[in-house]
């Protein structure tokens, strides 16, 4: 069972001093921040017992395994159901405490009732303040039964529940009709899932015989020991004032566990601490009684004395619960109450015994849960004891349960049961997760869900290049930390698997499923520099760059050009996808803008060093295009162009630019300036005969404007090849006059 205790401090004279504390003895309890331990939760449960709303209660965490609830302002704040939840995963457990008002009309004779399936449970509500009205019993807040007020027997109202079943479990209350719910007697009924002394699915397994008021858990067969007792069968008493599964916790305050109610996981419920009794756990046990709620009787023999915390204290020469066993009778010594082994291991188990006559090897045997008897393979005989060593065959899951070491001599016999837990080594259910990658390293999260049993003691990460037959590399890591696999090959796929281990021999689980993780490319190291750039228009920029010469192949997939517009806070990125490219045309830029320009080599997703930046000012946008451009051949070497001025000019035109290109030619176009902006006609001279030309033009004010439409015209035939076109302008009217 989960080591979880809910302590209620019952100093009821002052509700402000009342507190509830939930203490977990579980490893990693309450940390909450990691995957291995969810936090402890402690709260008032208002689903069944609803009380008037008050100020919110204060929750204080004391370290990782304790949480305390305070801030009760009036007695009614205390009445009701409180619960603490702790433990992880399938072991998550709720412990419940039910608080009754000491001033209620009806008070429970006993708050917690733990019964077996099929038993008859009897809840008894004692009359504290009589009313002459019906008594209504409720179960989990819903009507259950009515008693006439005359039906009180001996000042008590009894609710008999025959043949109870697990669904009958819950919170029961007895209330006088018309009385406040706060005046009710509240009970907790816990119905074990099995009949007396049985546990497990189908209730086929036998309980270990829990001592000192311990209760056998119907799911796992473990004894839930009363506060102040420990051991597989609760056979050992803790020192006064101690509690917890290993007696590791100490009651707060100078009066030890006085005034504290202890609630433990079902099916135990709640009781006073060992040595105390009464509704407020403030009364010491009467002589001859001991244990939680003083429910146990000592009945010491052979001069033993009764200690209210631990039971019989035997004089020299005697032992046993009632000091009924002579030390001449053989006795099993110091047997651990619980052992844990991993599946498929072959452990050695030792069992030591003493007595008179002295036990020998053959007189000590080990019995498994299925009844198989193992004989010891060797024995170590010492003056005061004989230790028998047993070699256990390969363990299977069915070996989990209660084993027994038994010693028999002519002086009598003794046996000691102990719990063996066969644990399944953990196996990852998922592959590890890739967090980040570089060219030579991978950062991996090894923490995955797993089947089998924790705790996880070590995590091994196995990795090797994909499709490789070479040995796996292995790294052992802390379970809660990310792992960096280093010194890997760039641009390489690696198969990565997790292996988890739990403590103990044979605790290594099978490897988890593989996953493919690929390292990044090598980083490009070459730094380009910008050779030059020129503006090809108000929104176009041609850029060229170079790379240093180095031996070997170029490490790179292409270039990234970056233009930063500082005014607008905008970045433009242009990808040039050939590593051989050394020039690029950037279009769609914003005219009149000051850009910072740089270039970087890239490889896969990695960028190399950027070139030193250049600063480029694009001219502002120019005027609209000239209209109605027309071309007319004049001779075998001359073509006249005519046009109309652009409309809606933002200012005076400074010049026109004519672009001349041989139709279908592969050469660069020729640009000719018309420096007299008032003209609307020009003659292009020096053309080749019988050649088809393309013409377009644009105006310039502060910057070049938009291109006009393109026109085609051919020179007349059979002239000699000219040296190249030139231009002569005049006003259109003048040309017409001629």
């Amino acid at each position: 069972a989960v080591d979880l205790t809910l302590l209620a401090n019952l100093r009821l004279t002052d509700p402000q001093r009342f507190f509830l504390t939930c203490v977990s003895g579980e490893a990693g309890a309450g940390r909450g921040s990691d995957a291995w331990g969810p936090p402890l939760l402690l709260e008032k449960d208002d689903r069944i017992v609803r009380t008037p709303p008050g100020p919110p209660l204060r929750l204080a965490r004391n370290g990782s395994h304790q949480v305390t609830l305070r801030g009760f302002s009036k007695p009614s704040d205390l009445v009701g159901v409180f619960s603490c939840v702790g433990g992880a995963g399938a072991r998550r457990t709720r412990v419940i405490y039910v608080h009754n008002s000491p001033g209620a009309h009806l008070l429970p004779d006993k708050v917690t009732h733990t019964v077996n399936k099929g038993d008859t449970a009897v809840l008894s509500a004692r009359v504290h303040k009589e009313k002459q009205t019906d008594v209504i019993w409720k179960s989990n807040g819903s009507y259950f039964y009515t008693l006439d007020w005359h039906e009180a027997q001996d000042g008590r109202f009894l609710l008999q529940l025959p043949n109870v079943q697990p669904p009958s479990s819950g919170i029961y209350s007895a209330t006088y009709l018309e009385a406040s719910p706060l005046g009710s007697a509240f009970f907790r009924l816990i119905v074990r899932g099995c009949g007396a002394g049985r546990w497990g699915p189908g209730c086929t397994k036998e309980c270990p015989g829990c001592l000192h008021g311990g209760v056998c858990h119907d799911h796992d067969g473990e004894c839930v020991c009363p506060p102040g007792f420990t051991g597989t069968r609760c056979e050992q008493a803790c020192r006064e004032g101690r509690f917890g599964q290993s007696c590791q916790e100490q009651c707060p305050g100078i009066s030890g566990c006085r005034g504290l109610t202890f609630c433990l996981p079902d099916p135990y419920g709640c009781s006073c601490g060992s040595g105390w009794r009464g509704s407020q756990c403030q009364e010491a046990c009467a002589p001859g009684h001991f244990g939680a709620d003083c429910r146990l009787q000592c009945q010491c023999q052979n001069g033993g004395t009764c200690d209210r915390f631990s039971g019989c204290v035997c004089p020299s020469g005697w032992h046993g619960v009632h000091c009924e066993k002579s030390d001449r009778i053989p006795q099993i010594l110091n047997m651990a109450s619980e052992l844990e082994f991993n599946l498929e291991t072959m452990p050695r188990i030792n069992c030591a015994a003493a007595g008179n006559p002295f036990p020998v090897r053959g007189s000590i045997e080990l019995r498994k849960p299925d009844g198989t008897v193992l004989l010891s393979t060797k024995a170590i005989v010492e003056p005061e004891k004989t230790t028998a060593e047993f070699e256990v065959p390969r363990l299977v899951l069915a070996d989990s349960g209660f084993w027994e070491c038994r010693v028999s001599t002519s002086g009598g016999q003794d046996s000691r049961r102990f719990k063996v837990n066969v644990k399944v080594p953990p196996v990852p259910l998922a592959a590890p997760r890739l967090l980040t990658k570089q060219s030579r390293q991978l950062v991996v999260s090894p923490l995955v869900s797993f089947s089998g049993d924790g705790p996880i003691s070590t995590v091994r990460l196995h990795y090797r290049p994909q499709d490789s037959t070479m040995d796996w590399s292995t790294i052992v890591v802390d379970p809660s930390e990310n792992v960096t696999l280093m010194n890997l090959r760039p641009k390489t796929g690696y198969s990565v698997r997790v292996q988890l281990s739990r403590p103990g021999e044979g605790g290594e689980g099978a490897w988890g499923p593989p996953t493919l993780m690929t390292t990044d490319c090598p980083e490009p190291l070459l730094q380009p520099w910008l050779e030059g750039w020129h503006v090809e228009g108000t929104d176009r920029l041609r850029v060229s760059w170079s790379l240093p010469l180095v031996p070997g192949p170029l490490v790179g997939d292409g270039f990234l050009l970056r233009l930063w517009d500082g005014t607008r806070g905008q970045e433009r990125r242009e990808n040039v996808s050939s590593p051989q490219a050394r020039t690029a045309l950037l279009t769609g830029l914003t005219p009149g803008t000051h850009y910072q320009l740089d270039v970087q080599l890239y490889h896969c997703t990695l960028l190399g060093p950027a070139s030193p930046p250049a600063h480029v000012l694009l001219p502002p946008s120019g005027p609209p295009a000239p209209r109605h451009l027309h071309a007319q051949a004049l001779s075998d070497s001359e073509i006249q162009l005519t046009w109309k001025h652009p409309e809606a000019l933002p200012g005076p035109i400074s010049k026109y630019v004519v672009e001349v290109q041989v139709a279908g030619g592969a050469g660069d176009p020729l640009w000719i300036d018309v420096d007299r902006p008032e003209e609307t006609s020009t003659i292009i001279r020096g053309l080749n005969a019988s050649t088809r030309y393309l013409f377009r033009m644009r105006a310039s004010i502060q910057g070049l404007g938009d291109w006009s439409n393109t026109v085609e015209e051919s020179t007349l035939g059979n002239g000699l090849q000219a040296e190249g076109p030139v231009q002569e302008s005049r006003a259109a009217e003048e040309g017409l006059d001629q």
Partner: antibody, heavy 117, light 110 residues
Amino acid sequence: EVQLLESGGGLVQPGGSLRLSCAASGFTFSNYKMTWVRQAPGKGLEWVSSIYPSGGWTYYADSVKGRFTISRDNSKNTLYLQMNSLRAEDTAMYYCARQEDGGYGTWGQGTLVTVSS
Amino acid sequence: QSELTQPASVSGSPGQSITISCTGTSSDVGSYNLVSWYQQHPGKAPKLMIYEGSKRPSGVSNRFSGSKSGNTASLTISGLQAEDEADYYCCSYAGSSTYVFGTGTKVTVL
């Protein structure tokens, strides 16, 4: 669904006897206090008798004490009202009702008893 | 076991609030907070509207509320609706495990 169904009513002469039954379904009958309430034609409701779950405690209105007997059979989920020495003033619609908390939360549709010569 | 006294009739317009009184003695209404109220439509069985003085069963409109002062209990219907037209009866615990009903009030929605 919680249901109560009365039966056994009818015409009876003064001084005669009648036994009413109330069949319960849809709930754990043996856990509830049960009551008979009657309503004379055109008149108000009148509490007649109550019986506790165990059957050991029974109570009657003064007007019927000594003549009527309430009983129950928890194994048959049935409530009874044995009416002897009937009088004309016992003529009424007889309802059985289930009591939970402080009220009669579930009622049958009633059975009519007419005492007349 | 004398009956509790209720007004024979109470009327109100839709949307109005009305209050029905139920007067008993110090032996019944005055001693216990165990008054319940029932609504009965013609030809139908009664229906529990309020119990233990002021508690409403689930499914009953919050327009119905109960209160008590001294020997008199009251049922208030707010936001009167046509379907509220019915007979209403109070009932009180009278001690010694006996109960007593009221004379009944006819509620008319004008």
